[in-house]
């Protein structure tokens, strides 16, 4: 049994920021879950993770240097990406995994969202190459 995911086919990131909403055919209330956003056709880069637990505050992090935040709805997670670079224009895939209660569930691969980064060309300073908020 797989969860279905709906995403916008395309989003334009003006001012180097975008909200990407992942809508699921599953209610996340009172579940332990891991929602993640992946970049590229092969989903090789895990951009952002939102971890939710019925007894804890939502935790959001990126291991790959993206500046991201996350918001939880009953059947959705919205990823808010900031400080995007023009060269990060790509296709982004939502993934959802429910760890508890058993059985483990995940999603059918979605069609993805092309995020087209326009606007200000952020120039990394020599000391800090790229966004590094965890």
């Amino acid at each position: 049994n797989k969860i279905l995911v709906k995403q916008s086919p395309m989003l334009v990131a003006y001012d180097n920021a975008v909200n990407l909403s992942c809508k699921y055919s599953y209610n996340l209330f009172s579940r332990e879950f891991r929602a993640s956003l992946h970049k590229g056709l092969d989903s090789a880069v895990e951009v952002c993770v939102v971890y939710g637990n019925y007894s804890q505050q939502l935790q959001v992090y990126s291991k790959t240097g993206f500046n991201c935040d996350g918001k939880l709805g009953n059947e959705s997670v919205t990823f808010y990406l900031q400080n995007l670079y023009v060269n990060q224009t790509d296709i982004y895939f939502c993934k959802i995994e429910v760890m508890y209660p058993p059985p483990y569930l995940d999603n059918e691969k979605s069609n993805g969202t092309i995020i087209h980064v326009k606007g200000k060309h952020l120039c990394p300073s020599p000391l800090f190459p790229g966004p590094s908020k965890p």
Partner: antibody, heavy 120, light 107 residues
Framework: QVQLVQSGAEVKKPGASVKVSCKAS????????IHWVRQAPGQGLEWMGS????????NYNEKFKDRVTLTVDTSISTAYMELSRLRSDDTAVYYC?????????????WGQGTTVTVSS | DIQMTQSPSSLSASVGDRVTITCHAS??????LNWYQQKPGKAPKLLIY???NLHTGVPSRFSGSGSGTDFTLTISSLQPEDFATYYC?????????FGGGTKVEIK
């Protein structure tokens, strides 16, 4: 309390295989990866691989990929590490440890270790 | 694979000393760096996670700092029970890798 309890010491001949078990208790087995880390005598720590009991996905260190097999039995919350074609330099203490599946970056609980001696 | 280089490999110190151990990553790992303590014949114990966060039950004399490629573990006032080997470990990307260890011995 949260515990990982490993099987006892093993002595094996070169070319043989060894299977080490790791029984988890005190937490939700499917919320954590189980990792295997080894330590040769007087040496440092070497990550061998991990398995996630929820979907049985595995991740192996290339160095061991063709010789190590990680499995789980979720009904008894136990993970297994089998290492084949043993050589003398596989003599080491083998540890199981866990990391959270949602917050995966550190190993917060460790088994007591299983000594595997490979000798002819 | 990301290489983790620890220094020094060993050091001698006295009770009450301030001890600093460094760890260098071969590429940017942001804050995804953990520190462990291991005593002879025992399993490692987590001390610090995500570069600077003290694990539950770990005394406050232990602290961690750094981000990117360079990290430090500091013991502000060495206690008799702190004589052990310390390892750093990167948790940024698989395969997870450890530093070679730093043995803290009694002077």
């Amino acid at each position: 309390q949260v515990q990982l309890v490993q099987s006892g010491a093993e002595v094996k001949k070169p070319g043989a295989s060894v299977k080490v078990s790791c029984k988890a208790s005190g937490y939700t087995f499917t919320s954590y990866y189980i990792h295997w880390v080894r330590q040769a005598p007087g040496q440092g720590l070497e990550w061998m691989g991990s398995i996630y009991p929820g979907n049985v996905n595995t991740n192996y260190n290339e160095k061991f990929k063709d010789r190590v097999t990680l499995t789980v039995d979720t009904s008894i919350s136990t993970a297994y590490m089998e290492l084949s074609r043993l050589r003398s330099d596989d003599t080491a203490v083998y540890y199981c440890t866990r990391s959270h599946y949602g917050l995966d970056w550190n190993f917060d609980v460790w088994g007591q270790g299983t000594t595997v001696t490979v000798s002819s | 694979d990301i290489q983790m280089t620890q220094s020094p490999s060993s050091l001698s110190a006295s009770v009450g000393d301030r001890v600093t151990i460094t760890c260098h990553a071969s590429q940017n790992i942001y804050v995804w760096l953990n520190w462990y303590q291991q005593k002879p014949g025992k399993a490692p114990k987590l001390l610090i996670y995500k570069a600077s966060n003290l694990h539950t039950g770990v005394p406050s004399r232990f602290s961690g700092s750094g981000s990117g490629t360079d990290f430090t573990l500091t013991i502000s006032s060495l206690q008799p029970e702190d004589f052990a080997t310390y390892y750093c470990q990167q948790g940024q990307t698989y395969p997870y890798t450890f530093g070679g260890g730093t043995k803290v011995e009694i002077k």
